[in-house]
């Protein structure tokens, strides 16, 4: 069964800046990745970025840089200032859509005890 992993990290240099990394563990080819915060995209979450392997990347503030790391993993850097910036207990979700298998999603947040720069 395919799985999705999510890793959230606070940048040591900018304490209100976050990096979210997500990956898909499965055999299907990825058609679309959606990153959201505040919960899954279908349950009140707000879309931060949508990554398509052919048609490119769309991102919305406070997302600063979304990119593919591999064919089955992505990373997203969030801007750390402004009213819409994330806080330490924000939940981030990644949804990987693979055709014709379907979609798999997972969520993660920064562990309360983690120091800046450590992986979640």
């Amino acid at each position: 069964t395919p799985e999705v992993w999510v890793q959230v990290r606070m940048e040591a240099t900018e304490l209100s800046s976050f990096t979210i990394r997500c990956g898909f563990l499965g055999s299907g080819s990825i058609s679309l990745v959606t990153v959201s915060w505040g919960g899954p995209n279908g349950a009140g979450g707000t879309t931060l970025a949508v990554l398509h392997p052919e048609r490119g990347i769309r991102q919305w503030a406070p997302a600063r840089q979304a990119r593919w790391e591999t064919q089955s993993s992505i990373s997203l850097i969030l801007e750390g200032s402004g009213a819409s910036s994330p806080c330490a207990n924000t939940t981030f979700c990644c949804k990987f859509a693979s055709f014709p298998e379907g979609s798999w999603e997972a969520c993660g947040s920064l562990p309360p005890s983690s120091d800046p720069g450590l992986s979640a």
């Epitope: 052919e54 048609r55 055709f99 979609s103």
Partner: antibody, heavy 120, light 107 residues
Framework: EVQLVESGGGLVQPGGSLRLSCAAS????????MSWVRQAPGKGLELVAA????????YYLDTVKGRFTISRDIAKNSLYLQMNSLRAEDTAVYYC?????????????WGQGTLVTVSS | DIQMTQSPSSLSASVGDRVTITCKAS??????VAWYQQKPGKAPKLLIY???NRFTGVPSRFSGSGSGTDFTLTISSLQPEDFATYFC?????????FGQGTKLEIK
């Protein structure tokens, strides 16, 4: 303008074969996942077969596995459904449809359909 | 397979009425739900995708809502051209499955 035009339907005896075609135009055919959906007279919609834009990953309805084959010819902008060992219960209107990644794989464009009647 | 149960299976209404069709999934399908309209002898047409997004050219009287397992298609003020059969569909997990359809008829 996106257009999908099916052909190849007709009357065939049980155990016989048919090859359905779907001519696509108005979009980059190679970039989209495609499907065949059927509708028996007075009944609902049923996904029969689907093929990923990479032409590798496919899906088949359990009752047609081993009998039907979905394929496409990028050079001809055409989708095909080879149907062998046809049964009475395969009688239906067959539609080809395009899937849009950005719409959660919803089928955004459909052909007009072609009627397949399996009867002796 | 994920089952999509639509209700009602048929519905009689008048022009100007507000109509609601519901669809219940046998397990969570995230937001991967679409609604289609089909008229006799014609192919289905996409109305709504991702639960609540109207497809190009779809009038604003059509709206979708819901999350998880329960979804709704609402037509705020029925027009003569809206009398048709409506299908919900999930595209969360293969195989994509459809509801059995709701036939909307003129009262």
């Amino acid at each position: 303008e996106v257009q999908l035009v099916e052909s190849g339907g007709g009357l065939v005896q049980p155990g016989g074969s048919l090859r359905l075609s779907c001519a696509a135009s108005g979009f980059t055919f190679s970039s989209y996942h495609m499907s065949w959906v059927r509708q028996a007279p007075g009944k609902g919609l049923e996904l029969v077969a689907a093929i990923n834009s990479n032409d590798i990953n496919t899906y088949y309805l359990d009752t047609v596995k081993g009998r039907f084959t979905i394929s496409r010819d990028i050079a001809k902008n055409s989708l095909y459904l080879q149907m062998n060992s046809l049964r009475a219960e395969d009688t239906a209107v067959y539609y080809c449809a395009r899937h849009e990644d950005y719409y959660g794989f919803a089928m955004d464009y459909w052909g007009q359909g072609t009627l397949v009647t399996v009867s002796s | 397979d994920i089952q999509m149960t639509q209700s009602p299976s048929s519905l009689s209404a008048s022009v100007g009425d507000r109509v609601t069709i519901t669809c219940k999934a046998s397990q969570s399908v995230s937001n991967d739900v679409a609604w289609y309209q089909q008229k006799p002898g014609k192919a289905p047409k996409l109305l709504i995708y991702y639960v609540s997004n109207r497809f190009t050219g779809v009038p604003s009287r059509f709206s979708g809502s819901g999350s998880g397992t329960d979804f709704t298609l609402t037509i705020s003020s029925l027009q003569p051209e809206d009398f048709a059969t409506y299908f919900c569909q999930q595209a969360y997990r293969s195989p994509w499955t459809f509801g059995q359809g709701t036939k909307l008829e003129i009262k």
